[in-house]
């Protein structure tokens, strides 16, 4: 029977800069029941605080709700593991909420084949930003990426869409059924998961772009 091994805070993520969650990996348990607590202070503050919510993020997590989330301060946090034989502490982790944003995927992806009379046909897609993100505040710039592939193909073709929420693709294989997905990331932060796939059948008479 031993004191617990050193835990590690391995990830912190925010969906929208308004709340965030951090997760830790326990070290070895030393063969005894082990209690974990996360403590933190904010830069410029010597008062220590304890995790306000150990439940919402699941096991080995700490969730910071709106009233505990500040964009303008770096958080300094650590996890303490304690059993009957002693304690161990994780390394301190410095967290700036601005840099840990991972949005939800974009919503309402729609894809259409457009066949104008006077121009080459193209695939047109549009989507909406995730609902948790309020772009009106100006705190966010969201960037988008699209990927598509024929249903039976192994490789995805990826296109960067910048800040626009619609996109055109000209070169497609006629008669194929395509899967299309979109994802987003803030200017500082992480890519979202890909949106659920939208399927589109390309007509057999679709004229390939030269």
């Amino acid at each position: 029977q031993l004191p617990p091994g050193k835990p590690e805070i391995f990830k912190c993520r925010s969906p929208n800069k308004e709340t965030f969650t951090c997760w830790w990996r326990p070290g070895t348990d030393g063969g005894l029941p082990t209690n974990y607590s996360l403590t933190y202070h904010r830069e410029g503050e010597t008062l220590m605080h304890e995790c306000p919510d150990y439940i919402t993020g699941g096991p080995n997590s700490c969730h910071f709700g709106k009233q505990y989330t500040s964009m303008w301060r770096t958080y300094v946090m650590m996890v303490n593991a304690t059993n009957q034989m002693g304690s161990s502490f994780s390394d301190e982790l410095y967290v700036d909420v601005t840099y840990i944003v991972q949005p939800d995927p974009p919503l309402e992806l729609t894809v259409e084949v457009k066949q104008p009379e006077d121009r080459k046909p193209y695939l047109w897609m549009k989507w909406s930003p995730p609902t948790l993100i309020d772009l009106k505040t100006g705190w966010f710039t969201l960037l988008y990426e699209i990927r598509l592939k024929p249903e039976k193909a192994a490789e995805w073709e990826t296109h960067f869409a910048g800040q626009q929420t619609e996109f055109k693709i000209l070169s497609l294989h006629p008669g194929q059924k395509y899967l299309v997905q979109v994802r987003c990331k803030p200017d500082h932060g992480y890519w979202s998961a890909w949106s659920p796939a939208t399927f589109i059948q390309i007509p057999s008479d679709f004229i390939m772009n030269d």
């Epitope: 410029g44 503050e45 306000p52």
Partner: antibody, heavy 118, light 107 residues
């Protein structure tokens, strides 16, 4: 609606003990830091103790360290202050305070009066 | 411990006027700073936290500014219910401390 209701105050002789309680309702008590603050006519507001959600972090003012003990029972939504070796200068209205934004209480009880006198 | 000095001790103004209350800290508290209002027989009420953020339900006529050692609470146009005692508070370091209070009274 949030309610914090203190009880346990009263008249006690110097050197005596009292246990204050604070019953909380209307919020998820177990998630929040809680505090005891007292107010005397002479000294104004004085923050005397702080306890984190699972009692991992506890602070005391120097004026009460070694004499007062803060504790909580999350299962019963209750906060406590055990006061021993009471002195005349501990005479005050004692407020329980919680629902914090980074340690700042947004909600307070109405207070309970503690008088230490022979 | 960090000492907070409020000025003036008493401020006499009329409804509709602008009130400016000051608080100076003996050392920097960054922006870990709050303002409370207290009326006779009542508990303090949080007005401003983090130096300039209004607490839930606080009218927009209340605003806070400052960082480091000098802080100001401004009430843009006094309402009759604003006459009370105002306390500043720091929580940059333990012990958390309060100023001695400014009494805002009707002229």
């Amino acid at each position: 609606e949030v309610h914090l209701v203190e009880s346990g105050g009263g008249l006690v002789q110097p050197g005596g003990s009292l246990r204050l309680s604070c019953a909380a309702s209307g919020f998820t008590f177990s998630s929040y830091e809680m505090n005891w603050v007292r107010q005397t006519p002479g000294k104004g507001l004085e923050w005397i103790s702080h306890i984190s959600s699972r009692s991992v972090i506890i602070y005391y003012a120097d004026s009460v360290k070694g004499r007062f003990t803060i504790s909580r029972d999350n299962a019963k939504n209750s906060l406590f202050l055990q006061m021993n070796s009471l002195r005349a200068e501990d005479t005050a209205v004692y407020f329980c305070a919680g629902i914090t934004i980074f340690g700042i209480p947004e909600y307070w009880g109405q207070g309970t009066l503690v008088t230490v006198s022979s | 411990e960090i000492v907070l000095t409020q000025s003036p001790a008493t401020l006499s103004l009329s409804p509709g006027e602008r009130a400016t209350l000051s608080c100076r800290a003996s050392q920097s508290v960054s922006s870990y700073f709050a303002w409370y209002q207290q009326k006779p027989g009542q508990a303090p009420r949080l007005l401003i936290y983090d130096a300039s953020s209004r607490a839930t339900g606080i009218p927009t006529r209340f605003s806070g500014s400052g960082s480091g050692t000098d802080f100001t609470l401004t009430i843009s146009s006094l309402e009759p219910e604003d006459f009370a005692v105002y306390y500043c508070q720091q929580r940059s370091s333990w012990p958390i401390t309060f100023g001695q209070g400014t009494r805002l009274e009707i002229k």
